[in-house]
């Protein structure tokens, strides 16, 4: 997208990791076929995406889950992509809510979120859950990732 | 996105094409407002989108279908994008789930998955799904794509 | 992605506004955690994304719902990503469907919309839905972008 | 079962041209990525070209390149390796190969003899 | 291009005992996870036969005395119990990078 050294190309992609965590942000894992072009974007922690350059970002997350209406909370499961910048508050930029299904013992749903957002250097993106133990892991189910216009 | 001779855009999208195969794999047509930058990218045997370049793509698919869950079996409806290249393991890249819906006779739903991946020249991508003949095809409700950073 | 001044980047990225209107068409604000970009990609009349520059996007959108199975019609929720460019006929580019949820008193449900299109000068992209008053447009629940490749 | 036969080499001068074929069988052949290996005469082997399943993508070295074309027929599961301006040292027996990961399944070769 | 340095050339081994062949890429042929090299075996007046795939796996049909090992730039054919239909040509190969390589190949023969 951007060539040569002044512009290199910019972007990541990352895989669900299961967490013995009780935390709602969800875990990631440079395994698998990811995607991490270079040091300036990173994953921090295994949960969150840092990038050095400030710039318009498409960030997007997909998030699958299994869950059954009776054994869940009333509210519905909801996920949400959300930044944390230097100096500055926490804020939500997209969220998607699924209501759980009927299906025993759970049923499976998919969500993806996206968008293109401006990012300041130093910016940290990641990804919160209602209930992370509902969160389904198996190959290409749930993953994270941006990429620098 | 690529500018000059050296860096031409690359990008891709293509429209669902009902199909009377038997197969999992998806089938798409140049067809209604589909897009194709240049020979660099090539829909194959109308089921797979062919890079001749190496390179970061962001690669989506979208899928609607009518699903009914007495009518259909206990496991879910799953999107599959997957990835084929010469002398390489096949790959999933990324899956959805959707249960099934208990509307009559069937219930709609959408999924979408969307990622960046790094392909190698001649690599193919594709889509898999549990039943096609689920699929939808009315317009703009099906369809795949790419586009390269 | 388009560097120096021959080729700036175009990207927006609208968030949802509740309106008394009665219209299928929904409604964005520049409000929150808004990007855009320059005045080569514009928001009219709230309602659509107007670009000034000929060229291949990804367009995206984002919906989410609360609906109830035997509140609403029989027909399911579908979301239209739609265009409209001068002098030419209006185009469905995408299109997503969500039976209604049987959850009371109704049931959320997001859909994720997104493509690679050609676009001309002056061309405007907008989104229909079926029922704007399901719409959510609580923070990041409900938005639409686009970013020139 | 999966069958490959190649057919098509004989004797040419240099310079010369020729087309070799490969008939396949037992497979959805258009599924499948294609290639040409070549062995010269007591000496080891060498890849000669690579075609994707709907031969819209083809690679080949830089020994062969701009003088070799690989192409493919899906409805007639054909595969296709046309030579020109051969020379000496491409003398070999000529197999093609499908396969993913390895090589899994080859003809049993077609010999082009390139010689004055 | 990636070179394939096999080794040795040729190798006697007694009926029953182990035969080793090496092979050496000059970069790594490793790729998410997985290792693209291959093993052959060729006998006189026949096409290669794939014995092993992706450094290790054994392909469907082929006597588990061998196997393969290695990732990175260092691979191993190992012949667990030499027999007299193992006499054959083996060679190496990665699909990696284009141009696909393959070693120089290592004779195989009875002690």
């Known amino acids: 997208m951007q060539k040569g050294d002044q512009n290199p190309q910019i972007a990541a992609h990352v895989i669900s990791e299961a967490s013995s965590k009780t935390t709602s942000v969800l875990q990631w894992a440079e395994k698998g076929y990811y995607t991490m072009s270079n040091n300036l974007v990173t994953l921090e922690n295994g949960k969150q995406l840092t990038v050095k350059r400030q710039g318009l970002y498409y960030i997007y997350a997909q998030v699958t889950f299994c869950s059954n209406r009776e054994a869940s909370s009333q509210a519905p499961f909801i996920a949400s992509l959300c930044l944390k910048s230097p100096g500055r508050f926490e804020r939500i930029l997209l969220r998607a809510a699924n209501t759980h299904s009927s299906a025993k013992p759970c049923g499976q749903q998919s969500i993806h979120l996206g968008g293109v957002f401006e990012l300041q250097p130093g910016a940290s993106v990641f990804v919160n859950v209602t209930d992370p133990s509902q969160v389904s892991h198996g190959t290409g189910f749930t993953s994270f990732g941006l990429l620098k216009l | 996105m690529q500018k000059g001779d050296q860096n031409p855009q690359i990008a891709a999208h293509v429209i669902s094409e009902a199909s009377s195969k038997t197969t999992s794999v998806l089938q798409w047509a140049e067809k209604g407002y589909y897009t194709m930058s240049n020979n660099l990218v090539t829909l194959e045997n109308g089921k797979q989108l062919t890079v001749k370049r190496q390179g970061l793509y962001y690669i989506y698919a979208q899928v609607t279908f009518c699903s009914n869950r007495e009518a259909s079996s206990q496991a879910p409806f799953i999107a599959s994008l997957c990835l084929k290249s010469p002398g390489r393991f096949e790959r999933i890249l990324l899956r959805a789930a959707n249960t099934h819906s208990s509307a009559k006779p069937c219930g709609q739903q959408s999924i979408h998955l969307g990622g960046v991946f790094e392909l190698q020249p001649g690599a193919s991508v594709f889509v898999n799904v549990t039943d096609p003949s689920q699929v939808s095809h009315g317009t703009g409700f099906t369809s795949f794509g790419l586009l390269k950073l | 992605m388009q560097k120096g001044d021959q080729n700036p980047q175009i990207a927006a990225h609208v968030i949802s506004e509740a309106s008394s209107k009665t219209t299928s068409v929904l409604q964005w604000a520049e409000k929150g955690y808004y990007t855009m970009s320059n005045n080569l990609v514009t928001l009219e009349n709230g309602k659509q994304l107007t670009v000034k520059r000929q060229g291949l996007y990804y367009i995206y959108a984002q919906v989410t719902f609360c609906s109830n199975r035997e509140a609403s019609s029989q027909a399911p929720f579908i979301a239209s990503l739609c265009l409209k460019s001068p002098g030419r006929f209006e185009r469905i580019l995408l299109r997503a469907a969500n039976t209604h949820s049987s959850a009371k008193p109704c049931g959320q449900q997001s859909i994720h919309l997104g493509g690679v299109f050609e676009l001309q000068p002056g061309a405007s992209v907008f989104v229909n839905v079926t029922d704007p008053s399901q719409v959510s447009h609580g923070t990041g629940f409900t938005s639409f972008g686009l970013l020139k490749l | 079962q999966v069958q490959l036969v190649e057919s098509g080499g004989g004797l040419v001068k240099p310079g010369g041209s020729l087309r070799l074929s490969c008939a396949a069988s037992?497979?959805?052949?258009?599924?499948?990525?294609m290639y040409w290996i070549r062995q010269a005469p007591g000496k080891g082997l060498e890849w000669v070209s690579t075609i994707s399943g709907g031969g819209t993508y083809t690679y080949s070295p830089d020994s062969v390149k701009g003088r070799f074309t690989i192409s493919r027929d899906n409805a007639k599961n054909s595969l296709y390796l046309q030579m020109n301006s051969l020379r000496a040292e491409d003398t070999a027996v000529y197999y093609c190969?499908?396969?993913?990961?390895?090589?899994?399944?080859w003809g049993q070769g077609t010999l082009v003899t390139v010689s004055s | 291009d990636i070179v394939m340095t096999q080794s040795p050339d040729s190798l006697a081994v007694s009926l029953g005992e182990r035969a080793t062949i090496n092979c050496k890429a000059s970069?790594?042929?490793?790729?998410?996870?997985?290792?693209?090299m291959h093993w052959y075996q060729q006998k006189p007046g026949q096409p290669p036969k794939l014995l092993i795939y992706?450094?290790?796996n054994l392909e469907s049909g082929v006597p588990d005395r061998f196997s393969g090992s290695g990732s990175g730039t260092d691979f191993t054919l190992t012949i667990s119990s030499l027999q007299a239909e193992d006499v054959a040509v083996y060679y190496c190969q990665q699909s990696h990078e284009d141009p696909w390589t393959f070693g120089g190949g290592t004779k195989v023969e009875i002690k």
């Open positions: 970069q790594s042929v490793d790729y998410y996870g997985d290792s693209y």
């Open positions: 190969a499908r396969g993913e990961p390895g090589l899994a399944y």
């Open positions: 992706a450094s290790s």
């Open positions: 037992g497979f959805t052949f258009s599924d499948y990525y």
